[in-house]
């Protein structure tokens, strides 16, 4: 034995003295809706060490462990530690109804498992009212010009929007993450960017907008040069 | 001498084995753009144990060491912890020019010192095109109509937007936060919400934007019902 | 492949009105917009107007309103231009045309059908 | 409405002479400017959009430059499948408007 007894056991690199984290994320809004489209729930680790590198998942819906994840191979990082991903296919109705998700990552380099509990956000679900709006007139003296889709009074925050054109999709846009409104409802703007001589000859461009509240999780709206003319 | 030599150094406790944290935020776009108002950098330092609470600040403007900050009384957070703050007054011009401002922080409770530096985004700035829309006709079926003003094509992507009507602030309006386009610029939406009736009456509603790229900082557009029809 | 079919010439009196025809096919017919044009014997082409057969979405040049009505038929992939109160001053080659729109080119009137003649003679 | 002024009417070159014609607006059009070719008794052919980007399969002889109010498109070296009436076309604001026309015949 030595001198000195048993020797100090080493607290972590600093750069590691958390050890693993977890994040847990809801599936694409998109995908809660569709019935053509699956559904998942995602349980990533990051800054697992190379020393313990065995990751693992144990998954709960309500409280009552399920047996249905795929655990992705683990993927190494720049900074020598291993990332991990776990994902767990989800009904559509179960998100959609408040299902609570649960992922519990055990892992030796953790002083105990780390449980990540995510659902959709709770309260009443409100519908979206859709607004297009048509360039100013004095971006009219642009070559591109700013279709606008306003999306307001809707929650959960949730929501998927898309573009297209005579009914071919159209790839050109950006939208803004939901605002919170002063009512609790949440608001955004989808902006679809377009050559002038398309709007001006009259191809008549519709925002898509998918989300729970709607009938049939789907509305459309449309806008036009000749609309309302 | 103790059999066993000196005691082992105890682990942080896991709450915060990382130690403190240090946070460094810019001006708000609004105070370096108006000369009458004080921008200021301002780092903050949270998880500081009650072990060692004394935190020691350091600045540095491109390098060079300043002595004009202000280091607040630190306070006591819900987990035991403290939080601290110092507050640099910076030059509108210095911050405009991209000059780069450091805080070292100091404290017992971490190994070494943490530095954080901070500037204006890199780059060309690129000077915001402001459009207003009116409401949508659908919308004016409601008691409340949106009023739109879009900002885009800005870099960088500090920017203030501000609503008045006929020369008095209105309140009741939610920005979105900036959003990367596919050229590098920016662009957002700002929306005002207003009674139906007061659009209806032809009252005057202005967009008022601030933006390092604009002539004078500022530029302002209109919107009523009577506005170009 | 694209093509535009139109319909064959016409000898109207004056006064009388006449429908002409053109029919689409190698793309979806309800994906672009249909534009028509005139052009008198030796002289240049003017714009009538366009109709969008997604939405029956129409637009004139103010020169041709009341003269032409646009219309067209989903079911068969048709266009239709109907030219009322004819006089003499009518009498030309009528085009459809369509804009071609991939990425970031639009080309505007980019296909062409063969032309309608139109001789309006008592 | 927008006034295309193109001009030459008539012209009468040579084979393999560079040529140029010209089209004026009465007012800044945005590059928003076509050249088509139309041979007798057919129907016009798209060369030119946005002023300087050729059409996909016409020849590269054929070019267009301009901005504001003035256009031009040029064929660098003529050769005689180019005969025939050119016209330009201003679409940066509704109504579309034609320029009158070039007639180009070979000496």
């Known amino acids: 034995e030595s001198k000195y007894g048993p020797p100090c056991p080493s607290c972590p690199a600093p750069e590691f003295l958390g050890g693993p984290s977890v994040f847990l994320f809801p599936p694409k809004p998109k995908d809660t809706l569709m019935i053509s489209r699956t559904p998942e729930v995602t349980c990533v680790v990051v800054d697992v060490s190379q020393e313990d590198p065995e990751v693992q998942f144990n998954w709960y819906v309500d409280g009552v462990e399920v047996h249905n994840a795929k655990t992705k191979p683990r993927e190494e990082q720049f900074n020598s530690t291993y990332r991990v991903v776990s994902v767990l296919t989800v009904l559509h109705q179960d998100w959609l109804n408040g299902k609570e998700y649960k992922c519990k990552v055990s892992n030796k380099g953790l002083p105990s498992s780390i449980e990540k509990t995510i659902s959709k956000a709770k309260g009443q679900p409100r519908e979206p009212q859709v607004y297009t709006l048509p360039p100013s007139q004095e971006e009219m003296t642009k070559n591109q010009v700013s279709l606008t889709c306003l999306v307001k009074g809707f929650y959960p925050s949730d929501i998927a929007v898309e573009w297209e054109s005579n009914g071919q999709p159209e790839n050109n846009y950006k939208t803004t993450p939901p605002v919170l409104d002063s009512d609790g409802s949440f608001f955004l703007y989808s902006r679809l960017t377009v050559d002038k001589s398309r709007w001006q000859e009259g191809n008549v461009f519709s925002c898509s907008v998918m989300h729970e509240a709607l009938h049939n999780h789907y509305t459309q709206k449309s806008l036009s040069l000749s609309l309302g003319k | 001498e103790s059999k066993y030599g000196p005691p082992c150094p105890s682990c942080p406790a896991p709450e915060f084995l990382g130690g403190p944290s240090v946070f460094l935020f810019p001006p708000k776009p609004k105070d370096t753009l108006m000369i009458s108002r004080t921008p200021e950098v301002t780092c903050v330092v949270v998880d500081v144990s009650q072990e060692d609470p004394e935190v020691q600040f350091n600045w540095y403007v491109d390098g060079v060491e300043v002595h004009n900050a202000k280091t607040k009384p630190r306070e006591e957070q819900f987990n035991s912890t403290y939080r601290v703050v110092s507050v640099l007054t910076v030059l509108h011009q210095d911050w405009l020019n991209g000059k780069e401002y450091k805080c070292k922080v100091s404290n017992k409770g971490l190994p070494s010192s943490i530095e954080k530096t901070i500037s204006k985004a890199k780059g060309q700035p690129r000077e915001p095109q402001v459009y207003t829309l009116p409401p949508s006709q659908e919308e004016m079926t409601k008691n409340q109509v949106s009023l739109t003003c879009l900002v885009k094509g800005f870099y960088p992507s500090d920017i203030a937007v501000e609503w008045e009507s006929n020369g008095q602030p209105e309140n009741n309006y939610k920005t979105t936060p900036p959003v990367l386009d596919s050229d590098g610029s920016f662009f957002l939406y700002s929306r005002l919400t207003v009674d139906k009736s007061r659009w209806q009456e032809g009252n005057v509603f202005s967009c008022s934007v601030m933006h390092e790229a604009l002539h004078n900082h500022y530029t302002q557009k209109s919107l009523s019902l009577s506005l170009g029809k | 492949e694209v093509q535009l079919q139109q319909s064959g010439p016409e000898l109207v009196k004056p006064g009388a009105s006449v429908k002409m025809s053109c029919k689409a096919s190698?793309?979806?017919?309800?994906?672009?917009?249909m534009h028509w044009m005139k052009q008198k014997p030796g002289q240049g082409l003017e714009w009538i107007g366009y109709?969008?057969?997604?939405?029956?979405?129409?637009r004139y040049n103010e020169k041709f309103q009341g003269k032409a009505t646009l219309t067209s038929d989903k079911s068969s992939n048709t266009a239709y231009m109907e030219l009322s109160s004819l006089t003499s001053e009518d009498s030309a080659v009528y085009y459809c045309?369509?804009?071609?729109?991939?990425?970031?080119?639009?080309?505007?009137?980019?296909?062409w059908g063969q032309g309608t003649l139109v001789t309006v003679s008592a | 409405d927008i006034k295309m002024t193109q001009s030459p009417s008539s012209i009468y070159p040579s084979l393999g002479e560079r040529v140029t014609i010209t089209c004026k607006a009465s007012q800044d059009i945005n590059s928003y400017l076509s050249w088509f070719q139309q041979k007798p008794g057919k129907s016009p052919k798209t060369l030119i959009y946005r002023a300087n980007r050729l059409v996909d399969g016409v020849p590269s002889r054929f070019s267009g430059s301009g901005s504001g109010q003035d256009y031009s498109l040029t064929i660098s070296s003529l050769e005689y499948e180019d005969m025939g009436i050119y016209h330009c076309?201003?679409?940066?604001?509704?109504?579309?408007?034609f320029g009158g026309g070039t007639t180009l015949e070979i000496k």
């Open positions: 190698g793309y979806t017919f309800t994906s672009s917009v």
């Open positions: 109709i969008n057969p997604y939405n029956d979405g129409t």
């Open positions: 045309t369509r804009s071609f729109y991939y990425g970031n080119s639009h080309v505007l009137f980019a296909y």
């Open positions: 076309l201003q679409y940066d604001e509704l109504p579309y408007t």
